[in-house]
């Protein structure tokens, strides 16, 4: 009733209230030094300290650097908001083999089901494509669009399709849009709105640069905003995103107020000495023998994985493929186990990491 | 009203250490970021780091990584800064400054401490 | 860190002319739509003294015909119309990435 706008408009005569026209309510004043999670906040766990750019705040209230994605093999999930890290994941075409916090330690590219399998789930950016062998009656060779080419003269075992392990692949790990692990454990200390950039996965482009508001003497509420590539730590300690500066890098996930930046190794590269939110080392995959050479697709978020072939029929690694060019990258092959009797029961995921030995053999990579 | 007092002029013998103070008032100490900005003699600003008094949490410019730390009394709202290992080249002019929540800028300055250093 | 460049090094302006200083950085300083670049005033034997924010935002208190502009890496500080009082060094300063860094600063006379 438009008798009670100017009653409403002072907010009962309530100093730390005031009404907002845009949604018709009244919305809690947040206290010099803090700024609203949203546009109208409701009581004080709306409101919080600003971090710098590309710093978010962390559970702790510590202003931490969000994560870079800017390795070549990484793309922006989600990015960099005052209360979640800037999440990275691989670029289409790739999936993560090794997560790391908002972002992947190191990306594959997708395996293409060898002769005689076809894609029975495409790859995503945290999982390798999924390979099944042929339907009978079907042509091998061109049951699938991937998959046209003829097959090798190796047998393909008739088993069934092998995912990617928990244990290599990301998907149990990796954050999902909506929110990062950071976000979500800090949701229990930080009230947000259902519109806050953790409930939506669509952080405010505001960062906290709005105008000055006022933080009251003894406010146990003020929290503090941390400088730009800086993000608010578990511990509530400002904290340096990672640099992802380094030639064989590439940003995964971006600087946010409350995550890091995370760093991997860029395409073509493996990382054999991680780093928190980065790698100290990335080395060139190894390339192996044309039965598990793999070639990049392009087709956006897939990967693969297939059974391993039979014991006896294992491809060592050739300096270079067929033509003798080296391919952009190659997938790990089956050649990694290391215990024949696993070989029999275990397929072994395209997604496992792998060192080359001093033979030029990939090893199994236990870091 | 807002204000910034720092402790008085310092002259210090190379290797020692010196600690700068910076009390303010009129204002809520803990919430907002508390910055420290050094000017050698007819030169330019250079940012030292700063502190946010509610946690102590700091940033540094890497510069002085090691030999600058600071600190803060919430219960005086007392800024300090701590640089040891003195060298001539410290020879400046120290100030405090509150930076503002919002645009980062540094709207509230103390009036300077002079520390020389000379054997 | 990231460099600023401040030019120039002395401005000779007569009473009433347009001075209009320039900061260039190394990188960017754009930040969610805005640029984290500051200028201050600094009078001999004062602190720094806040004029512009965020690149173009003219602090409180600060008279009109002061005015920042620029954007990514270039930006500028200019008086409209010298005042006596205007004769200072000035400083740019970015907020972008930490260290915090300032320009060499620019020396406003009186021609």
């Known amino acids: 009733f438009p008798q009670d706008r100017p009653f409403e408009d002072t907010c009962h005569g309530n100093p730390s209230h005031y009404y907002d026209k845009a949604v018709r309510r009244c919305c809690y004043r947040c206290p010099m030094g803090l700024f609203p999670t949203q546009q109208c906040p409701q009581r004080p766990t709306d409101c919080r300290k600003q971090c710098e750019p590309d710093y978010y705040l962390d559970e702790a209230d510590r202003c931490t650097a969000c994560v870079t994605c800017s390795r070549d093999d990484l793309v922006e999930k989600t990015p960099c908001a005052w209360n979640s890290s800037r999440v990275c994941e691989c670029r289409p075409g790739m999936f993560c083999s090794t997560s790391a916090v908002n972002s992947c330690a190191r990306c594959f590219f997708h395996s293409v089901c060898p002769a005689g399998m076809i894609v029975k789930f495409p790859g995503t950016a945290q999982k390798n494509t999924v390979c099944e062998p042929a339907s009978p009656g079907v042509s091998p060779a061109c049951a699938s669009p991937e998959n046209c080419k003829e097959p090798s003269s190796g047998t393909i075992p008739q088993a069934k399709p092998t995912p990617v392990s928990p244990a290599t692949s990301s998907a149990s790990t990796m954050p999902v849009r909506g929110g990062t692990r950071l976000a979500q454990e800090a949701a229990s200390k930080l009230t947000r709105a259902p519109d806050s950039p953790s409930s939506v996965g669509r952080p405010s482009s505001d960062p906290g640069l709005s105008p000055t508001q006022p933080c009251p003497e003894g406010s146990g509420d003020c929290r503090k905003q941390c400088e730009p590539d800086y993000y608010l730590d578990e511990a509530g300690r400002c904290t340096a995103c990672v640099s992802c500066s380094r030639d064989d890098l590439v940003e995964k996930t971006p600087c946010a107020w409350n995550s890091s930046r995370t760093c991997e190794c860029r395409p073509g590269m493996i990382c054999a000495t991680s780093a928190t939110n980065s790698c100290a080392r990335c080395v060139p995959y190894p390339i192996c023998a044309a039965e598990t050479v793999t070639k990049p697709q392009d087709m956006a978020e897939k990967d693969t994985t297939f059974e391993a072939p039979p014991l006896g029929t294992q491809p060592d690694c050739n300096p270079t493929p067929e033509n003798g060019e080296a391919p952009a990258s190659t997938s790990p092959t089956q050649s990694l186990l290391v215990d024949s009797q696993a070989s029999k029961t275990l397929p072994i995921p395209t997604s496992a990491p792998v060192a080359l030995s001093s033979t030029g053999k990939p090893v199994l990579d236990a870091g | 009203e807002v204000q910034l007092v720092q402790s008085g002029a310092e002259v210090k013998k190379p290797g020692s250490s010196v600690k700068v103070s910076c009390k303010a008032s009129?204002?809520?100490?803990?919430?907002?970021?508390m910055n420290w900005v050094r000017q050698a003699p007819g030169q330019g600003l250079e940012w030292m780091g700063q502190i946010y008094p509610g946690d102590g949490d700091t940033n540094y410019n890497g510069k002085f990584q090691g030999r600058v730390t600071l600190t803060a009394d919430k219960s005086t709202s007392t800024a300090y800064m701590e640089l040891s290992s003195l060298r001539s080249e410290d020879t400046a002019v120290y100030f405090c400054?509150?930076?503002?929540?919002?645009?980062?800028?540094?709207?509230?300055w103390g009036q300077g401490t002079l520390v020389t250093v000379s054997s | 860190e990231i460099v600023l460049t401040q030019s120039p090094d002395s401005l000779a302006v007569s009473l009433g002319e347009r001075a209009t200083i320039n900061c260039r950085a190394s990188e960017s300083l754009e930040y969610y739509g805005t640029s984290l670049m500051l200028w201050y005033q600094q009078k001999p034997g004062q602190p720094p003294k806040l004029l512009i924010y965020?690149?173009?935002n003219v602090e409180s208190g600060v008279p009109d015909r002061f005015s920042g502009s620029g954007s990514g890496t270039d930006f500028s500080l200019t008086i409209s119309s010298l005042e006596p009082e205007d004769i200072a060094m000035y400083f740019c300063?970015?907020?972008?990435?930490?260290?915090?860094?300032f320009g060499g600063g620019t020396k406003v006379e009186i021609k």
């Open positions: 009129g204002y809520a100490f803990s919430s907002y970021w």
């Open positions: 400054a509150r930076r503002i929540n919002g645009n980062f800028a540094m709207d509230y």
């Open positions: 965020s690149a173009s």
């Open positions: 300063q970015q907020r972008r990435k930490v260290p915090s860094t």
